[in-house]
Structure formats: C-alpha cells, structure tokens
C-alpha cells in the first residue's frame, strides 16, 4: 500500500526494564487503523543494523531481522488492530539494554517513538529469623540481582537509625556468572518490632518486611521498577 496523505500519527512508548533470563515487554501503542493489512510495525535498536522485529500485512516479516534477536521477538498479533505494537522479548539478555524505536506506518500516516530499555536482574527478598545464630538475628535473602545493589536495613521502632554497624551483607555470584545472590544479616534484633530489608540498584527497588512479636512472625515483600512509568 502507499501513504497518500502526509499526516503523522501518534505513537506512545513507555520506558521499561527487563529481568535477564526472563521475558520482557517493550510497550508501544499507536492510533489504530481499520485494516490490519495497512499496518506496518518496525522495531529498531540504536547501534543494531538489522531490525529487531517487523510486522506487516498481518504477519511477521523477519527477513531483515538482526541475528541477536532471532527467535526471541513477537508482537501481540491479535492486538495490533486496536493499536498495540508492544514487543515481547524472550530470554532478555544484558546486551538488550539500549534505545529502541517503535516505528509505525498505517494508511493514516507514519509515526515513531523511542524508549529506553534497561536490563538487569531483580528479585523479591525474603526475610527470616535466623535461629542458628547465637543472638536474635534476621537474614534477608534475594536470589538474583544485577548490577550489584545496595542493602539498607530499617526498623519501625528505631526510625532513622543506621544499622550498617550491626549488619553484614554479602554478594555471591550465581552459576551463570552475571547475577548475584544477595544475603544480608542483621544482628541484635528486638522483638515487637518491624524490620525492613531494602535492596536497590538503578533498575529496581525491593523491600522485604518482617514483623516479629512474641506470638507470631509476619512477612511481606514488594518490588518496584525504577525510572519506569508502568
């Protein structure tokens, strides 16, 4: 098909982060067209010669796909007609980080938008009471992080207290030689208090909370991606 008008269409992307070894999503939406056959989606990456992915005439067109993305990309084909050009990236690699462009051509015109994609490793921490220790001790463990994060302890009772003198953090390289297991131990813990183990790098921030009372132990964790509007 040809573009007869000279209009530009609105394309919107969202900065995001990928967890290496897992699947990721590069988000992109556009003004939809009524005919699927009139929509072309091209994903590009700065510094890469071939295409990351191309979808045209209702199907994938991968003849110009770059080798580094071979077999790892897919669009949500059934959602293209409603303006979803998001890309699913399988088995995210550290080298997938960078600037991407979502380039759209429809019968209404063309448009594009860039997005920054960060890659690393991040995981939920789990905080437990270490019964093997000689004193009351908490152990915070998170299996996969990269780049190396910072670990900070906090407590509800002693707000603003600095626990660096009574804690010890270690990083153990995992078998794939990229990500690391994070282990942090907090000593001299008092009961009837809630402690938080906060792990953070430039991609994600995760917190593991543990409430220790004489009668019970309650745990809660959450993880938040940084610099992402999603």
């Amino acid at each position: 098909f040809g573009i007869s008008g000279r209009h530009s269409i609105t394309v919107t992307t969202v900065a995001s982060a990928g967890n290496i070894g897992e699947d990721g999503i590069l988000s992109c939406t556009f003004e939809p067209d009524i005919k699927l056959s009139d929509i072309v989606i091209q994903w590009l990456k700065e510094g890469v010669l071939g295409l990351v992915h191309e979808f045209k005439e209702g199907k994938d067109e991968l003849s110009e796909q770059d080798e580094m993305f071979r077999g790892r990309t897919a669009v949500f084909a059934d959602q293209v007609i409603v303006g979803n050009a998001s890309l699913r990236l399988k088995n995210v690699q550290l080298t997938d980080a960078g600037t991407y462009k979502c380039y759209i051509i429809t019968s209404k015109g063309k448009g594009n938008a860039n997005l920054e994609y960060k890659t690393g490793a991040f995981s939920m921490p789990e905080v437990n009471v270490d019964y093997n220790a000689s004193s009351e001790t908490l152990r915070c463990e998170a299996p996969r992080w990269f780049p190396q994060p910072t670990v900070v302890w906090a407590s509800q009772v002693d707000q603003g207290a600095n626990f660096s003198e009574v804690s010890n953090t270690s990083f153990e390289l995992n078998s794939e030689n990229v990500t690391m297991k994070v282990v942090s131990v907090l000593y001299n813990v008092t009961i009837n208090n809630t402690y938080s183990c906060m792990i953070e790098n430039d991609i994600a921030k995760a917190t593991g909370d543990i409430k220790v009372t004489e009668s019970e132990i309650k745990r809660r964790s959450h993880l938040q991606l940084l610099n992402s509007k999603a």
Epitope: S4, R6, G47, V48, L49, D66, E67, M68, K101, K110
Partner: antibody, heavy 117, light 105 residues
C-alpha cells in the same frame, strides 16, 4: 563536541591495499553503529559499508563486497576500513559517518584516496 | 535495488522558496533524510525522519514525504543555501539520491 576524524588516505597503485581510520570523540562510540560513505570526484554520495555498535554485524555495498572490510575497536574509539584489491573507480573522498536510526547525523571531514598507476 | 531520483539542478531567487524532490517507489512508507553539502565540505544533515530538523538547522528547512515523492523545502532562500542536496533512505544499506545542485540566482 561530537567529532569524527578520518585518516589513512593517500595515493596507491591498482591492486594494492590501504587502511582508513576514523577517530571518534565526544560521544559513547560503543553505543552507535557507524558507516563509511565515499564520493568520487564530481560525483554524488555512495554508501560503502556499515557496522553495528558491537562490531558483530556488517553490511557492504555490492561494489566493494569481498574487497573491503569494515571493523572497529571500541576500546580505542576507532572505526576502520581495510581496502584490498583497489581499483581506479575506488578513487574518492571517504567519509565516516555515525548512524542514527535510518540516517546519519554526524560526518567526518573526509580523507582522499587516489588509486592510480 | 531501491533507487532515488532527484532533479540535477534547481534555481531560485533569493527570498523565494526552493523545492527539491526525491522520487522513489512508495517512498512515503520509508523514512527520508536530507543532507546539504557545500563545495569542499562534508555533508550536513538538515532534515531527518521526513520532516524533523536537527538542532542548529534553521526553521526555513522543512520536509515532507508521501506517495512516491519526498520533498525538501527551503523557504526565504539565502545565498548561503547554495549547495548540493541529497536525499537518503535505508534499505539494508544507505541509499542516496542522485543529488540536486541548488543555485541561488
């Protein structure tokens, strides 16, 4: 300031070799794909070759395929063009240019290659 | 392979508008870039992605692209705009137009 400076041009006999260099500064060289473009005397621009940021992928114009090799050393912020089996029609000003998506946003000042017996 | 055709020359009086065309099969579906090259100098990007202008390029330079023709428009032409102009697209390599010499009368 973003800058590209070519060097290595000169006069060479047909069939001989020459290596051009392009020193980059003012940007993260290892993040960007690069190109070589040439211009014969009194003629238009002709794309020669492109290389990905990592150096793992390269494309060539049909006119130089099998004779020219593009490469890069990201630790030295330098782009290269190894030109073998040179012909008279390879005589041109050779520019290195930084690739930006589907175009080129920064060009060097060029280095002149003359192939003559 | 993909080909781009430009008029060899365009002449315009100072203060008037110059239009340089670039023809290619369904070029409207491609992203077109324009370069200005003055004698003895390297090319300079003046318009990218059909109609966007790099910083430092005057607003007098604009571009459009539809159907089989992309157009570079230079309004209020000045003597300093006299140069060769090249359109370019990507098609598994950089494809350049044949070039247009802009003469300011």
């Amino acid at each position: 300031e973003v800058q590209l400076v070519e060097s290595g041009g000169g006069v060479v006999q047909p069939g001989r070799s020459l290596r051009l260099s392009c020193a980059a500064s003012g940007f993260t060289f290892g993040d960007r794909a690069m190109n070589w473009v040439r211009q014969a005397p009194g003629k238009g621009l002709e794309w020669v070759s492109a290389i990905s940021s990592s150096g793992t992928t390269s494309y060539y114009a049909d006119s130089v395929k099998g004779r020219f090799t593009i490469s890069r050393d990201n630790s030295k912020n330098t782009l290269y063009l190894q030109m073998n089996s040179l012909r008279a029609e390879d005589t041109a000003v050779y520019y290195c240019a930084r690739k930006r998506w589907y175009g080129m946003d920064v060009w060097g000042q060029g280095t002149t290659v003359t192939v003559s017996s | 392979s993909y080909e781009l055709t430009q008029p060899p020359s365009v002449s315009v009086a100072p203060g008037k508008t110059a239009r340089i065309t670039c023809g290619g099969n369904n070029i409207g579906s491609k992203s077109v870039h324009w370069y200005q090259q003055k004698p003895g100098q390297a090319p300079v990007l003046v318009v990218y992605d059909d109609s966007d202008r790099p910083s430092g390029i005057p607003e007098r330079f604009s571009g459009s692209n539809s159907g089989n023709t992309a157009t570079l428009t230079i309004s209020r032409v000045e003597a300093g705009d006299e140069a060769d102009y090249y359109c370019q697209v990507w098609d598994r390599g950089m494809i350049f137009g044949t070039g247009t010499k802009l003469t300011v009368l």
